[in-house]
């Protein structure tokens, strides 16, 4: 960057390089160049010349000031004029940043996906610092009182081989960067409390035509968890409202499940399932898409869906599993 | 020519709180970060925490939380740290130290205050 | 927290010896924000190098300073009686900003 550059001088920030964004600050230059005493110091801020709020502090040295600076980066350089030099001559120059110290973490939440191998460890980190800014996750055992620390710039995935200190842990978060520190306050967590079940996938989907026509959705999980809670929720995609549908499932086979809804509309169904009784959710599954036939039965499966239609065929379509904004994965 | 200077040795009790007081002189003192370390009779210098006296604006090392409080009278220029809760752990010299943007670093140190904690 | 290693803790050298101390952070730290400070008993640190390889106002042209990322070092080209004190390097890249231990330097 411009740090690199060969200096015949000397640029500098009051207060200083890394800064709280919005401040007044000072950038200084002091020209040390043999045979020249400058006529004039000139400041650039990305290459461009700055023209207002610059003083002439003394001979070698001057000032740009500027008010409620809030550019998170920017490449400050001066130049002087010497007598008898065509061209300016480059002093110094210094990369700059401004930001914010980190917010207190909050919501701290360690979850064990199952089969990963790995505590995932995630958290709010509150308002963007726009500064370089690290976290440690402290992991402590309530058993055997050892901490292990991981150094993170986001989330964190720690494996479960590592956490050998038994099954309770406090878990907390320190957020750092040049403008300051904070940390959260502690999760108590039981590694058997935190697992959520592999994931819950929608394969297909079948509408019988009967008397009231029923759509069968079908769907599995690959879990060998045995107690475990499940919500579909479907609506039609014109809708705002989710309905949703509770079970207790054991995945030992492919469920299926009944609903009655409306001829020639398309819906869209989603899936998510916990361990019985305990805290957090899988996320909903991906958005599966399913059009009710107008009279003629239809099959929609995960592979084939088109809003193709063929004179009393079955036809199959491909679900995209694209994410709309109701579809956050939340584990709270 | 910049100076800080700082209040004098303290022998308190523990339990009891203590302020001390650093005086600065030679420059803008509302234009510079002002920090704090300690440093303990054999042992390394930690970092306390700065205040910004301009707008009052603290940063605390965490370990520090709740033992330190930094604060300023831009009337006199002054800084000044309480240490609350005291125990002998705390005692050691206490130094003020001004963060210059030249150097962008520590670039003048008050003399220190020492303190001693017993009963 | 950054933990800065300073090494040798303790390290006597001659009059006119080559002397290198090192530093070394826990995790990366820009050359920017590694100082080095010195402190001889009974006095304040005194600022000595600042961002690694700039000499402060007044310390001596055989003192130099090297180095990045998590490795760093404090090089003195002639050991001189005055130069026998405790050095201390120092991040100032992420709070809490930390000091390694120091390296006292005595005359041999």
């Known amino acids: 960057g411009i740090t690199n550059i060969n200096c015949s001088g000397h640029i500098w920030v009051e207060p200083a390089t890394i800064f709280k964004m919005g401040m007044n600050i000072s950038i200084y230059c002091q020209a040390a160049i043999k045979n020249c005493q400058p006529r004039k110091l000139h400041f650039y801020k990305n290459g461009i010349k700055e023209r207002f709020q610059i003083t002439r502090i003394n001979k070698t040295t001057a000032r740009l000031w500027y008010k409620n600076f809030l550019e998170p980066h920017a490449s400050m350089y001066c130049t002087a004029e010497c007598p008898k030099h065509f061209q300016e001559t480059l002093i110094c120059g210094k990369d700059i940043s401004s930001g914010y110290p980190p917010d207190i973490p909050d919501e701290v939440t360690c979850v064990i996906y199952e089969y990963s191998g790995n505590m995932t460890c995630t958290w709010n980190a509150g308002k963007l610092t726009y500064i370089d800014t690290k976290y440690v996750v402290h992991v402590k055992s309530l058993e055997t009182e050892e901490e292990q620390q991981y150094l993170t710039s986001s989330y964190i995935n720690i494996s479960t081989d590592s956490l050998q200190g038994g099954k309770k842990y406090l878990v907390w978060v320190q957020a750092a960067n040049a403008l300051g520190m904070e940390e959260s306050k502690q999760l108590q967590i039981h590694l058997d409390d935190i697992v959520i079940p592999s994931a819950a996938v929608i394969s297909r989907a079948e509408t019988i035509n009967a008397t009231v026509p029923k759509t069968i959705i079908y769907w599995d999980s690959q879990t060998t968890i045995e107690k475990v809670s499940c919500e579909m929720r479907y609506k039609a995609t014109t809708n705002q409202t989710w309905n949703v549908k509770e079970f207790d499932t054991n995945f030992t086979y492919v469920q299926q499940s009944e609903f009655y809804l409306e001829p020639n509309i398309k819906y869209v169904f989603q899936v998510r399932c916990q361990e019985t009784g305990k805290r957090y959710w899988q996320p909903w599954s991906s958005l599966f898409f399913h059009k009710t036939p107008e009279t003629v039965p239809q099959v929609t499966s995960k592979a084939f869906q088109h809003d193709t239609w063929n004179s009393g065929l079955t036809v199959a379509s491909i679900s995209t599993g694209h994410l709309t904004s109701d579809n956050r994965g939340d584990i709270g | 020519e910049f100076q800080l200077q700082q209040s004098g040795p303290e022998l308190v009790k523990p339990g009891a709180s203590v302020k001390m007081s650093c005086k600065a002189s030679g420059y803008t003192f509302t234009n510079y970060y002002m920090h704090w370390v300690k440093q303990s009779h054999g042992k390394t210098i930690e970092w306390i925490g700065y205040i910004y006296p301009n707008s009052g604006d603290t940063s605390y090392n965490q370990k520090f939380k709740g033992k330190a409080t930094l604060t300023v009278d831009k009337s006199s220029s002054t800084a000044y740290m309480e240490l609350r809760s005291l125990t002998s752990e705390d005692s050691a010299v206490y130094n003020c130290?001004?963060?210059?943007?030249?150097?962008?670093?520590?670039?003048?140190w008050g003399q220190g205050t020492s303190v001693t904690v017993s009963s | 927290d950054i933990v800065m290693t300073q090494s040798p803790a303790i390290m006597s050298a001659s009059l006119g010896e080559r002397v290198t101390m090192t530093c070394t952070a826990s995790?990366?730290?820009?050359?920017?924000?590694l100082h080095w400070y010195q402190q001889k008993p009974g006095s304040s640190p005194k600022l000595w190098i600042y961002s690694t390889s700039n000499l402060a106002s007044g310390v001596p042209a055989r003192f130099s300073g090297s180095g990045s990322g998590t490795s760093y070092s404090l090089t003195i080209s002639s050991m001189e009686a005055e130069d026998a004190a405790t050095y201390y390097c120092?991040?100032?890249?992420?709070?809490?900003?930390?000091f390694g231990s120091g390296t006292k330097l005595e005359i041999k």
């Open positions: 130290a001004r963060f210059g943007g030249f150097y962008d670093a520590m670039d003048y």
């Open positions: 120092h991040q100032y890249h992420r709070s809490p900003f930390t």
């Open positions: 995790s990366s730290v820009s050359s920017s924000y």
